[in-house]
Amino acid sequence: HNTTVFQGVAGQSLQVSCPYDSMKHWGRRKAWCRQLGEKGPCQRVVSTHNLWLLSFLRRWNGSTAITDDTLGGTLTITLRNLQPHDAGLYQCQSLHGSEADTLRKVLVEVLADPLDHRDAGDLWFPGESESFEDAHVEHSISRSLLEGEIPFPPTS
């Protein structure tokens, strides 16, 4: 799986979208989890409604919400009041039994509020970082990591 980077501003909301094949994942609940450390498990943050037919209903856990468009095949996660500690590696998952398939790996980046006594010139925006100069930008807050730019490279 490629990793897609979503950027949000501290104090604001960030929407993460995870597209999937609606036929392949028909009848499956979805979840959003956070990768703990380099080799740790993916800790469940929030999952869709227990009844798959009600997956369109938004479910909250703290400041994180999840909703699933099962016909269109798009899982949407909202992180409200984004904070620095929300930055990290996450996964969108499709659940079946005790197993979970990864729909998308997501790297959440939190930017400082440009209005919070900061100069816009100090902030980084997609396309301006040498590390990601060839990365594919899906929209204003999302981009894919290049091959080899994995967040948790093997320990040297």
Epitope: A87, E109, W124, P151
Partner: antibody, heavy 122, light 107 residues
């Protein structure tokens, strides 16, 4: 075991700039916060700013905004802190520190460099 | 910015005594708080992270507690090597500020 090795002591003139390096070895680099902390003689610790190399975006304390630039080179596992328009009050030991956990939530400083003494004097 | 106020500024105690150091935040930092020990001429050393988790290799006599705005570092029985300056730091929001420090000195 992670090690952070900083560049050597510097003596600078007021108005000039200094660039201190911090090379990390013995562990991964990309997803861990690197913070820069300074300590003036006989004073406490002062957080200047930090960066997560994989993101490339640095965050700075208001006090240093516009004067400090923090960067990281993933290819060499090296972080840099450049402070410009130096004045005598900038005389201090400058430390780099790496988080013990990944990203900002793990930015408690588990590993520290040996410190770099920067003396600003005319 | 979040201001961390440490008290007392100086604590004069004898070896074997219990030391209680306080760190108060100007607003909630949840549990995103660390404690460091620093001796003269040395870099700081991490003692506690996430308010109550002891770092690897730190003796059990060091313990941290609290959440929100009030935090405590306790040294249950002071050893000669514990006399140093102690700092708290928050890392919930930028800038990641430090407290002014508490010096634990031999009485």
């Amino acid at each position: 075991q992670v090690q952070l090795v900083q560049s050597g002591a510097e003596v600078k003139k007021p108005g000039s700039s200094v660039k201190v390096s911090c090379k990390a070895s013995g562990g991964t680099f990309s997803s861990y916060a690197i913070s820069w902390v300074r300590q003036a003689p006989g004073q406490g610790l002062e957080w200047m700013g930090g960066i997560i190399p994989i993101f490339g975006t640095a965050n700075y304390a208001q006090k240093f905004q516009g004067r400090v630039t923090i960067t990281a080179d993933e290819s060499t596992s090296t972080a840099y802190m450049e402070l410009s328009s130096l004045r005598s009050e900038d005389t201090a030991v400058y430390y780099c520190a790496r988080g013990g956990g990944t990203f900002w939530s793990g930015s408690w400083a588990l590993y520290w460099g040996q410190g770099t003494l920067v003396t600003v004097s005319s | 910015e979040i201001v961390l106020t440490q008290s007392p500024a100086t604590l004069s105690l004898s070896p074997g005594e219990r030391a209680t150091l306080s760190c108060r935040a100007s607003q909630s930092v949840s549990s995103y708080l660390a404690w460091y020990q620093q001796k003269p001429g040395q870099a700081p050393r991490l003692l506690i992270y996430d308010a109550s988790n002891r770092a690897t290799g730190i003796p059990a006599r060091f313990s941290g507690s609290g959440s929100g705005t009030d935090f405590t570092l306790t040294i249950s029985s002071l050893e000669p090597e514990d006399f140093a300056v102690y700092y708290c730091q928050q890392y919930v929001n930028w800038p990641f500020t430090f407290g002014g420090g508490t010096k634990v000195e031999i009485k």
